[in-house]
Interface confidence: low
């Protein structure tokens, strides 16, 4: 008769370093001691008639296990083979490229290191969760790739490795390993340089805007825009809408960059560059200043008017140019009373690059001159009629304006100068009209004839 | 001729927002600055920012960094300007103005919109 | 920021008398602006680049001045001129205005 010896549990995975209880057992009669062969640590717990419980610890490589006893003077066997699975301790993407052009290829690489059995490990790349390549692990450590075409959808797209341990044919389930994900950066940055646009001319200490734009950028919010005049870097505001970046910023000449200068707009994405430059011009342009030798003027002094400006300026006050751009114009003339309020206009040219800017300035004299009342706004005698309403229309003129007073002859009595009155008959008679200021008083005689109201 | 009109005056209650509106004609909207200024009953002229309708860049006075929020659109010509977290200190009439360039200043204003915050 | 002081804060002045007030910049300025503010108004530009006269304003106005000091004069005052004036600069941001001179009819 045949017996057997049997070994249980029979072909047992399990995951490395664990342990596991085995039972030999025979249904031959004899009481033959049962060995457990194997080079893993072993311990017997328990033994009886026929059979022997072993106890395997920190299993942590595939074995093959037998048992062994002896029976009617033969030997039987049995055995049994531990699978060890074993998840990757390694899972890891290689670093991707910190930018990639949109339209070019690059390699996503894996590198998968332990894990058992191979037989049962696969290697997936993945961009989301969308599989790229699905590939086994092979060697030791396992690298798989896969060339992906870059595209705008994969900017900030997540890439990552997984590995997937398949022990569901032993009933244990799929052991998934993910790696550390890594974002990709891709780009777009036309070979085109930006649009510039900037002051030809701008004047010290003044402030103008320049905008620098370039379309077809992507993502336009990760470029990085650099905008200077001269060596003096701008202060700008980067506003993007769509792929198209516009940088702002408002430029301040001083006055030690006057002359010619550069405009630079630098616009850097993925670590490519480009650029424009404007030529702008710095000028300086004082003035004009107009002055007089005396604000204020005595009627018959003589007065100068300059007028000035800065260097390379060409004047010309009240028509008459400077003898040369640079020198200041001027004009005398013997105050008079027509000059009172009189303006003097200057006005500057400077050419900056083949273009004339002008300016202009003026200058108001005041003469003093005494008092005058003009005879031909003033009636020396008036015909009225009794209880009429009328106006004494008489003007004085003068700097400073004088006071305007008609007094009746001896009496002090005062009629209103251009404000109507009521008139009657006590009005009639001679008047003093008088003008008075600091610098004098102007007498006119107004003979007030008024004519007795009539009833019928 | 050129005409900055801004919308009518407006009645908040603390803590709330408003915008006003102010609508450019007579000149051509992205080409010129457009300011904004406050001033309360009694007081000077303040400062608030400018916007470049061209551009959409705002610069402000810091006092008003996280007050005013100026805005512009092309289409209508028409800058905006609002207000938020509005306090009793925010009741002013407010005036966008027109920047002509330095040879002429804030050179067209308009006339003004009133903003009271009262509970 | 550039603080404008502009004084006197408040005068008055009868018509034919000669105004003038002042505007002084906490650091110099290449280029003042007046603006001129009557109750219930919008300010209106006055003076430009210092010295310049805004279209429609009298000959009788006139500004002067440089680096940090700036004047407006009137030469002889007339009842319409009665109004508030404000200085401006905008060499740096902020821009600022004076606090204003009010010129009132005596």
């Known amino acids: 008769q045949e017996f057997l010896l049997r070994v249980e549990p029979q072909n047992p995975v399990l995951s490395a370093g664990g342990s596991l209880f085995v039972n030999c057992s025979t249904d031959c009669p004899s009481s033959e001691k049962i060995a457990l062969e194997t080079s893993l640590s072993k311990e017997l717990v328990a033994s009886g008639m026929g059979w022997a419980a072993f106890n395997l610890s920190n299993v942590t490589g595939n074995s093959r296990i037998l048992c062994s006893v002896y029976c009617n003077g033969s030997q039987i066997t049995g055995s049994s083979n531990i699978t060890v699975y074993g998840l990757p301790e390694r899972v890891e993407l290689a670093p991707l490229p910190p930018w990639q052009p949109v339209g070019q290829n690059f390699t996503l690489r894996c590198q998968v290191e332990g894990g058992s059995p191979r037989t049962s490990l696969t290697v997936v790349l993945l961009r989301w969760e969308e599989e790229l390549s699905r590939q086994p692990a092979v060697e030791e450590p396992a690298e798989v790739t896969a060339t992906v075409l870059a595209s705008r959808d994969d900017h900030g797209a997540p890439f990552s490795c997984r590995t997937e341990l398949d022990m569901q044919p032993q009933g244990l389930g799929l052991f998934v390993n993910t790696s550390a994900p890594r974002q990709l950066r891709t780009f777009v940055l036309p070979v085109t340089p930006p649009r510039l646009v900037a002051p030809r001319f701008l004047e010290v200490e003044t402030s103008w805007p320049v905008d620098c734009t370039l379309d077809g950028l992507f993502p336009a919010s990760e470029a990085q825009v650099y905008l200077a005049l001269g060596d003096q870097m701008l202060n700008a505001t980067v506003m993007n809408h769509g792929d198209t970046l516009t940088a702002t910023a408002t430029a301040t000449a001083r006055a030690d960059q006057e002359g010619a200068r550069e405009i630079v707009c630098n616009v850097t994405l993925g670590g490519e560059r480009r650029e424009a430059r404007e030529n702008l011009t710095v000028f300086s342009f004082l003035g004009p200043i107009v002055n007089l030798s005396e604000p204020t003027a005595h009627e018959g002094s003589t007065v100068t008017v300059s007028c000035m400006a800065g260097a390379r300026v060409q004047v010309t006050l009240d028509g008459v140019p400077a003898a040369a751009p640079g020198q200041t114009a001027q004009l005398q003339l013997n105050a008079t009373e027509s000059d009172d309020g009189r303006s003097f206009f200057c006005s500057a040219t400077l050419e900056v690059d083949g273009e004339f800017l002008h300016r202009n300035s003026s200058v108001q004299l005041r003469v003093l001159y005494g008092p005058k009342i003009d005879r031909a706004t003033c009636p020396q005698h008036l015909k009225w009629k009794d209880k009429t309403r009328h106006v004494l229309q008489c003007q004085a003129r003068g700097n400073p304006y004088p006071e305007l007073r008609c007094l009746k002859e001896g009496s002090s009595r005062e009629v209103p100068v251009g404000i109507p009155f009521f008139v009657n008959v006590t009005h009639n008679g001679t008047y003093q009209c008088q003008a008075s200021s600091s610098r004098g008083k102007y007498t006119l005689v107004v003979v007030m004839d008024i004519e007795a109201f009539s009833s019928h | 001729q050129v005409q900055l009109q801004q919308s009518g005056a407006e009645l908040a209650k603390p803590g709330a927002s408003v915008k006003m509106s102010c609508k450019a004609s007579?000149?051509?909207?992205?080409?010129?600055?457009m300011h904004w200024v406050k001033q309360r009953p009694g007081q000077g002229l303040e400062w608030i920012g400018y916007i470049n309708p061209n551009t959409d860049y705002t610069e402000y006075n810091q006092r008003f960094q996280d007050k005013a929020t100026l805005t512009a659109d092309k289409s209508s010509s028409t800058a905006y300007m609002q207000l938020s977290s509005l306090t009793s200190e925010d009741s002013a009439v407010y005036y966008c103005?027109?920047?002509?360039?330095?040879?002429?200043?804030?050179?067209?204003w308009g006339q003004g919109t009133s903003v009271t915050v009262s509970s | 920021q550039i603080v404008l002081t502009q004084s006197p804060a408040l005068m008055s002045a009868s018509p034919g008398e000669k105004v003038t007030m002042t505007c002084s910049a906490s650091?110099?300025?290449?280029?003042i602006y007046w603006y001129q503010q009557k109750p219930r108004s919008s300010p209106k530009p006055w003076i430009y680049l210092t010295s310049n006269l805004a279209s429609g304003v009298p000959a009788r106005f006139s500004g002067s001045g440089s680096g940090a000091s700036y004047s407006l004069t009137i030469s002889i005052m007339e009842a319409e001129d009665a109004a508030t004036y404000y200085c401006?600069?905008?060499?740096?941001?902020?821009?600022?205005f004076g606090a204003g001179t009010k010129l009132e009819l005596k």
């Open positions: 650091s110099s300025v290449s280029y």
């Open positions: 103005a027109r920047w002509g360039g330095n040879s002429y200043g804030l050179d067209y």
């Open positions: 401006q600069q905008w060499k740096s941001i902020p821009l600022t």
């Open positions: 007579g000149y051509t909207f992205t080409v010129y600055w």
